[in-house]
Interface confidence: medium
C-alpha cells in the first residue's frame, strides 16, 4: 500500500498505527513531540521499505532504536528535503542507536543527527555507502564515541562478523547496533545492490532485492516503478510521478491536492505528472492538464505571510520556484552547503522584482549573488531600520555581487549597507552604486572601506 502524501505523527504514539499497511510512504514521515515515554516494542512496521521524501524524528520519548520500528526501511529517496536533509534525528532523548540495519540508500540529501544525548553507534556507520556527499552531513552534539564504547557484532568474542571500511583513514568494522552489521555488497556488483546472500541485483534495483538479476524482485527502484517492474524510464502513455513511479493520464487528472490548495489540478509536462507547470511554462487553459511555453519568464507573484521570507537552505528556496515577483522582503542566510549556487539559481533565478528589501547576511556558502540572475528591481517599499533596502553583512566568502557588464538592477527606494564582507572589493560595491542609481544615497558608514575586501586582492580604491 502506498501511503501519503506525507505522514505526520505527533503527540500520540498510537497514531503510529497509520503506518500499519504502508510499503511506500509517498512523501515525508514525521514522528515528533511524543512526550510520554511508551513501550514501542509492540509497534513494528516491517512492510515499510521506501520513503520518497525524508524522515524526521524529534523529541520522541522512550524510543531507543529505529530498527524495531522500521526493520526493512531500505531507501529514503529525498525527492523533497527538510532543509537539505533526507534524514533528521534531533533531540531524541532516549535513542540509543539508529538501528536502521536495512537502510542502504539515501538517494538525495544529507543527514542531520543532532543533540541526541544517549545516541551511540554513529561512528560505526559508513554513510558513504548509503549516500553520495557525506561532506554535507551534520552529526553534532550526540553521545561521545568514548562514552559509547561501540562494539560491532562478534568483536568481544574476537570473531568480528562485520566488514571493515575506511573513514578518514580509520579502518574499522561497520555496524548499526551491537548485533547488526552494516550490509555491504560484493565489489563484483559495482554500484548494483545485492540480496541478503550477496547475489547482485538487477541494475534497475535500488537498495536490495529478493532475487538476483530480476527487475521484478527489487525492494526499490533505481529509476521508476511501473506495474511490478523497475524500469529506466516510464513507458509510453505513462508519466513520472513523485520521482519514483509511472502513472497514467487518468490517475494524474484525478489527484486531489494534498493541501486542498488553490492549484488547478496536476499537469502533464515533459513526461511527468506534476502539481504545476515548471518554470518557463504556463497552462493553456485554467482546466488544462498541459503546459505551453511562456513569452519570456512566466509571471508568478509570490507572497510570504510574514512579509519576510528567510532563505536559509535549498529547501526554503524551493518555495520560490517560478516566482518572478516577490511581494515582501528577502532575507538570505545560507551558512553552509556545497555547490549551492546552482540549486539556488534553479529556485530563485526567475525573480525579477522584490517589492521590499533584500538582506544577505552570514551567508558563508555564497561566493556571488549571480544566482539571482534575473533580479532587475528592488522597490524598497519596506526598508530595514535605517532605511536600507539592500543590506549585505558578514558574508565571509562573497567575492562578487553580479556581473555588472550584463546586469541592469535598480533600487527604487532606500539605501545600501555593506560591512564585514572580507572578500568583497569596495570597487565592486561602488560599481553597484552606479548601476542601481543609489550613488549619493548612502551615508558615510554605510559602505565600510575597512572591513569589506580586506582579505581580497582588490585594485586600489582611490
Amino acid at each position: 500500500e502506498i501511503c501519503g502524501p506525507g505522514i505526520d505523527i505527533r503527540n500520540d504514539f498510537q497514531q503510529l498505527k497509520r503506518l500499519e499497511n504502508c510499503t511506500v510512504i509517498e512523501g515525508f514521515l514525521h514522528i515528533l513531540l511524543i512526550s510520554k515515554a511508551e513501550d514501542y516494542r509492540n509497534y513494528r512496521f516491517p512492510k515499510l521499505t521506501v520513503i520518497t521524501e525524508y524522515l524526521l524524528l524529534f523529541r520522541v520519548a522512550g524510543l531507543e532504536s529505529l530498527g524495531d520500528l522500521f526493520p526493512n526501511l531500505t531507501v529514503i529517496r529525498g525527492w523533497k528535503l527538510f532543509y537539505n536533509y533526507a534524514l533528521v534525528i534531533f533531540e531524541m532523548t532516549n535513542l540509543k542507536d539508529i538501528g536502521l540495519y536495512n537502510l542502504r540508500n539515501i538517494t538525495r540529501g544529507a543527514i542531520r543527527i543532532e543533540k541526541n544525548a544517549d545516541l551511540c553507534y554513529l561512528s560505526t556507520v559508513d554513510w558513504s555507502l548509503i549516500l553520495d556527499a557525506v561532506s554535507n552531513n551534520y552529526i553534532v552534539g550526540n553521545k561521545s564515541p568514548k562514552e559509547c564504547g561501540d562494539m560491532c557484532p562478534g568483536t568481544l568474542e574476537e570473531k568480528p562478523l562485520c566488514e571493515k571500511t575506511a573513514i578518514n583513514n580509520e579502518y574499522n568494522y561497520r555496524c548499526w547496533t551491537t548485533n547488526r552489521c552494516q550490509k555491504m555488497c560484493p565489489s563484483a556488483c559495482g554500484k548494483r545492490a545485492c540480496t541478503e546472500n550477496n547475489e547482485c541485483c538487477h541494475p534497475e534495483c535500488l537498495g536490495s532485492c529478493h532475487a538476483p538479476d530480476d527487475d521484478t524482485a527489487c525492494v526499490a527502484c533505481r529509476h521508476y516503478y511501473f506495474s511490478g517492474v523497475c524500469v529506466p524510464a516510464c513507458p509510453p502513455n505513462t508519466y513520472r510521478f513523485e520521482g519514483w513511479r509511472c502513472v497514467d493520464r487518468d490517475f494524474c487528472a484525478n489527484i486531489p491536492n494534498a493541501d486542498g490548495g488553490d492549484s488547478e489540478g496536476f499537469v502533464i509536462h515533459d513526461g511527468e505528472c506534476m502539481q504545476e507547470c515548471p518554470s518557463g511554462f504556463i497552462r493553456n487553459g485554467s482546466q488544462s492538464m498541459f503546459c505551453i511555453p511562456c513569452e519570456g519568464p512566466c509571471p508568478k507573484v509570490c507572497e510570504e505571510d510574514k512579509k519576510t521570507k528567510t532563505i536559509d537552505s535549498v529547501n526554503s528556496a524551493q518555495m520560490l520556484q517560478g516566482c518572478t515577483i516577490f511581494k515582501g522582503n528577502l532575507l538570505i542566510n545560507i551558512r553552509r552547503g556545497n555547490n549551492i549556487a546552482s540549486e539556488l539559481e534553479n529556485f530563485m533565478g526567475l525573480i525579477e522584482v522584490v517589492t521590499g528589501y533584500v538582506k544577505i547576511s552570514h551567508s558563508h556558502a555564497l561566493v556571488s549573488l549571480s544566482f539571482l540572475k534575473n533580479l532587475r528591481q528592488i522597490l524598497g517599499e519596506e526598508q530595514l531600520e535605517g532605511n536600507y533596502s539592500f543590506y549585505v553583512l558578514d558574508n565571509q566568502n562573497l567575492q562578487q555581487l553580479w556581473d555588472w557588464d550584463h546586469r541592469n538592477l535598480t533600487i527604487k527606494a532606500g539605501k545600501m549597507y555593506f560591512a564585514f564582507n572580507p572578500k568583497l572589493c569596495v570597487s565592486e560595491i561602488y560599481r553597484m552604486e552606479d548601476v542601481t542609481g543609489t550613488k549619493g544615497r548612502q551615508s558615510k558608514g554605510d559602505i565600510n572601506t575597512r572591513n569589506n575586501g580586506e582579505r581580497a586582492s582588490c585594485e586600489s580604491d582611490i
Epitope: 486531489p256 488547478e264 504556463i282 497552462r283 482546466q287 509571471p299 507573484v301 515577483i325
Partner: antibody, heavy 117, light 107 residues
C-alpha cells in the same frame, strides 16, 4: 487585496458593438486566468470564456464564440471583452472574475449592458 | 457540455436550521465543484472550492462535500444574512457550467 474594477453601465444600440473593460490593479494581473460571466436580469450565471493575461491564450464557451472577443492590455493591467452584433438577448450584467481552484474567487462589480434603440 | 442539476430551486427555512442544497453533475467531475452565494442586488461570492475547501473569510457554518457526480452544500445554524441564491459551478471540463441556482428564504 485583489480588486477588479468595471464600469457600471453601457447603453448600446442593436447591431452595434461594445467593449467592456476590467482593470486589475497591482501585480496580480498576469498571474490569474481572467474569466467573463453573463447574468441576465433575474436569471442564472453563464460562463463566456477565459483569457490568460500573460500570453493572451483564450478559451471560449462555444455558445459565445461568435459573440465575444477577449483581449488584454498588460501595460495597463486591463482585460477587455468585446461583444458584437448586439441584440436584446445580450442585455445583461457582465462580470469579470478570477479563479481559485477552478472556482471564481474575486468578482468585478459587473457592467450592466442595455441594448436598446 | 456537463449539465449541473441543482435542487431544490427554492427553499424556505427558519433561523438556526441546518439546510442542505444538492448539485448533481451529468458526468464525473471529480472534486472540481465550487459553490457561490449571490445576495439580491449583489455580486456573486465564492463560498467553497474544490468541493470542500472553505474560501478565505467564509464562516465555518458553510461546508461542502461530495465527489464524482453528487455534491452538497450545508449551512448549519441559518442566519438572516444567509438569504441569497446559491449556485454550484463545475470546473472539470470546458465550458464551465453553473447550476440553475437555489433561492433560500427565511420562514
Amino acid at each position: 487585496q485583489i480588486q477588479l474594477q468595471q464600469p457600471g453601465a453601457e447603453l448600446v444600440k442593436p447591431g452595434a458593438s461594445v467593449k467592456l473593460s476590467c482593470k486589475a490593479p497591482g501585480y496580480t494581473f498576469t498571474s490569474y486566468w481572467m474569466h467573463w460571466v453573463k447574468q441576465r436580469p433575474g436569471q442564472g450565471l453563464e460562463w463566456i470564456g477565459e483569457t490568460n493575461p500573460s500570453n493572451s491564450v483564450t478559451n471560449y464557451n462555444e455558445k459565445f464564440k461568435s459573440k465575444a472577443t477577449l483581449t488584454v492590455d498588460k501595460s495597463s493591467s486591463t482585460a477587455y471583452m468585446q461583444l458584437s452584433s448586439l441584440t436584446s438577448e445580450d442585455s445583461a450584467v457582465y462580470y469579470c472574475t478570477i479563479g481559485r481552484g477552478r472556482g471564481f474567487a474575486y468578482w468585478g462589480q459587473g457592467t450592466l449592458v442595455t441594448v436598446s434603440a | 457540455d456537463i449539465q449541473m442539476n441543482q435542487s431544490p430551486s427554492s427553499l424556505s427555512a427558519s433561523l438556526g436550521d441546518t439546510i442542505t442544497i444538492t448539485c448533481r453533475a451529468s458526468q464525473n467531475i471529480n472534486f472540481w465543484l465550487s459553490w457561490c452565494q449571490q445576495k439580491p442586488g449583489n455580486i456573486p461570492k465564492l463560498l467553497i472550492y474544490k468541493a470542500s475547501n472553505l474560501h478565505t473569510g467564509v464562516p465555518s457554518r458553510f461546508s461542502g462535500s461530495g465527489s464524482g457526480t453528487d455534491f452538497t452544500l450545508t449551512i448549519s445554524s441559518l442566519q438572516p444574512e444567509d438569504i441569497a441564491t446559491y449556485y454550484c459551478l463545475q470546473g472539470q471540463s470546458y465550458p464551465y457550467t453553473f447550476g440553475g441556482g437555489t433561492k433560500l428564504e427565511i420562514k
